[in-house]
Amino acid sequence: EVEKTACPSGKKAREIDESLIFYKKWELEACVDAALLATQMDRVNAIPFTYEQLDVLKHKLDELYPQGYPESVIQHLGYLFLKMSPEDIRKWNVTSLETLKALLEVNKGHEMSPQVATLIDRFVKGRGQLDKDTLDTLTAFYPGYLCSLSPEELSSVPPSSIWAVRPQDLDTCDPRQLDVLYPKARLAFQNMNGSEYFVKIQSFLGGAPTEDLKALSQQNVSMDLATFMKLRTDAVLPLTVAEVQKLLGPHVEGLKAEERHRPVRDWILRQRQDDLDTLGLGLQGGIPNGYLVLDLSMQEALS
C-alpha cells in the first residue's frame, strides 16, 4: 500500500506522457489522476515505466475500479497486463476479439500463463461460446491451445469452429480429446467430397470408430502410416487385412517397420497368419492356420 501524500506544486499530471518516468513512486501516486490514467491507458505502453512505477499505476486503476476494469481500459493495458493476477482478471468482462489479441500479443512467445488462461476463460464466457474467430486467434498464438482443454470444455466447441483448426493444433491432443473433436469434425466437413473430406478429417481420425475406418477403406484414401499409428487401437483391431490394405493403399508397406508398435502389433495378433501373408511383407505373429478364434468380448456381452 503506497502512503497518501500531497502532490508537490506544479507536478500534477495533465496528461500521461514521458515526463512521468522521472516521478518517484509516491509522486505518481499523488500526482496522477486515476480517471486520467484510465482514459489515456493506450499511452502507457509507449512509455518506459519501471516495474515499480507500473505497480503504482495498477494500484490506481484498482482503486478506481474495485469491481473490475471496464473493457475500454483492459484493451489498452499493454505490459500492465503482466502485472495482473488471475484474481484480478476474474473480475473482468471481456468480449472483444481486439482486446483478446492485444493482450495475447503482450504475452507472445511465452508459455500460456495462468493470467492468459484466465483471460481466455473470461473471454469465452463473455462471448457465450468458443466460436471460430476465437479459435482462430487462440491457435495462432498458442498452437497447442485446443489440446489444453478438457473433453468437457471441448464439448462446448460448435462444429462450425472446427474449420479454424489446423493439423498442428491437434499434435498434442490425447485420444479422449480426439473422441470429442472427431464427431464435430465429421459434422463440419460432411458436405465435402471424398478426397477433400479426407484431407480435412485426417487430423481428427484418432477419434474415429471402426465403422468410419471401414467406410474410408472403400474410398481409395491412401492413409499415411503416421495417421494410421494415431488411430484408436480398439477401432483398428476389428479391421480385416483387406480393409487395412485398402485404407493404406501404397503405404501398406510401412506396416513392417511398425510391426512392434501399437496399434499395428495388436492388430497383427488378431489376424490370421495366412491373411497377413497375402500382404507379402513378412509380418509375423498372426493366428496360426487351423486355430479357432473366439471373440471373448462377444461371449461376455451375451452372458
Epitope: Q75, T95, S96, E98, K125, K132, D133
Partner: antibody
Framework: QEQLVESGGGLVQPGASLTLTCTAS????????MCWVRQAPGKGLEGIAC????????TYYASWAKGRFTISKASSTTVTLQMTSLTAADTATYFC????????????WGPGTLVTVSS | DVVMTQTPSPVSAAVGGTVTIKCQAS??????LAWYQQKPGQPPRLLIY???NLESGVPSRFKGSGSGTEFTLTISDLECDDAATYYC????????????FGGGTEVVVK
C-alpha cells in the same frame, strides 16, 4: 458534429470494378471499427466488411464477401471498399457505419451511396 | 457465420398498443445483441445494445431482453412514428459476425 459520408456510387456495367469511399468528419478515428453494410432495394441489411482503425488494423469479412471485396484505410479520415466482378446482385445502397473500439455496435451511419450494376 | 432469425414479419398493432419482435441466434451469443430501427430512405438508427441497454435519446417505450440465443424487442404505447422496419444484430467482432443482421421485421401501426 460527427458525420460519415459515402461517395463513389453510380451506374456500372456487370463485371466492372468500383471503389467506394467513406469520409469521416468530427470524429476521432483512432479507436473504432469502420464497417460497410449494404441494402438491396426492398431487402434487409447485409454486412460486408469491417476494419479496426488503430491497434491491429485487422480486417474482417463476411464469408460471401471474401475475395471480391477489399476494405482498407486510405487516410486518417477515409476508409474505402474496393469491389470487383460486380453483378446485378450487387445493386444496393452501400452504407458505412462506425462501430465502437470493442464491437460492431453501430451508433453512427452515413446516408448511403447507391450502386447500380446494369448493362 | 452466426445466423440471426427474426419473427414475425410484418407485425401490426394499433396506436397505444404493444408489439413484440423476436430474434433467434444460431449459436449462443450471450448478451451480444443490438436492435435498430430503419425508415424508408434513411440509414438504421441504434435503439438497444448489449441486449437490454437503451441507447441515449431513445424513448423508454422500447425494451430489449434476452440472452444466449433468444432475444425480444418490445415496443409499448405504440406511436405512428414507430412504423418502421426493425433489425437485430449480433455485435461481437470477428469474421463470423460481420454479416450478423436478422432479416428485419416490419411494424405496421394502425
Amino acid at each position: 458534429q460527427e458525420q460519415l459520408v459515402e461517395s463513389g456510387g453510380g451506374l456500372v456495367q456487370p463485371g466492372a470494378s468500383l471503389t467506394l469511399t467513406c469520409t469521416a468528419s468530427g470524429i476521432d478515428f483512432s479507436r473504432y471499427y469502420m464497417c460497410w453494410v449494404r441494402q438491396a432495394p426492398g431487402k434487409g441489411l447485409e454486412g460486408i466488411a469491417c476494419i479496426y482503425i488503430g491497434g491491429s488494423g485487422s480486417t474482417y469479412y463476411a464469408s460471401w464477401a471474401k475475395g471480391r471485396f477489399t476494405i482498407s484505410k486510405a487516410s486518417s479520415t477515409t476508409v474505402t471498399l474496393q469491389m470487383t466482378s460486380l453483378t446485378a446482385a450487387d445493386t444496393a445502397t452501400y452504407f458505412c457505419a462506425r462501430g465502437t473500439n470493442l464491437n460492431y455496435i453501430f451508433r453512427l451511419w452515413g446516408p448511403g451511396t447507391l450502386v447500380t450494376v446494369s448493362s | 457465420d452466426v445466423v440471426m432469425t427474426q419473427t414475425p414479419s410484418p407485425v401490426s398493432a394499433a396506436v397505444g398498443g404493444t408489439v413484440t419482435i423476436k430474434c433467434q441466434a444460431s449459436q449462443s451469443i450471450n448478451n451480444g445483441l443490438a436492435w435498430y430501427q430503419q425508415k424508408p430512405g434513411q440509414p438504421p438508427r441504434l435503439l438497444i445494445y448489449s441486449a437490454s441497454n437503451l441507447e441515449s435519446g431513445v424513448p423508454s417505450r422500447f425494451k430489449g431482453s434476452g440472452s444466449g440465443t433468444e432475444f425480444t424487442l418490445t415496443i409499448s404505447d405504440l406511436e405512428c412514428d414507430d412504423a418502421a422496419t426493425y433489425y437485430c444484430q449480433c455485435i461481437w467482432d470477428g469474421n463470423s459476425y460481420v454479416n450478423a443482421f436478422g432479416g428485419g421485421t416490419e411494424v405496421v401501426v394502425k
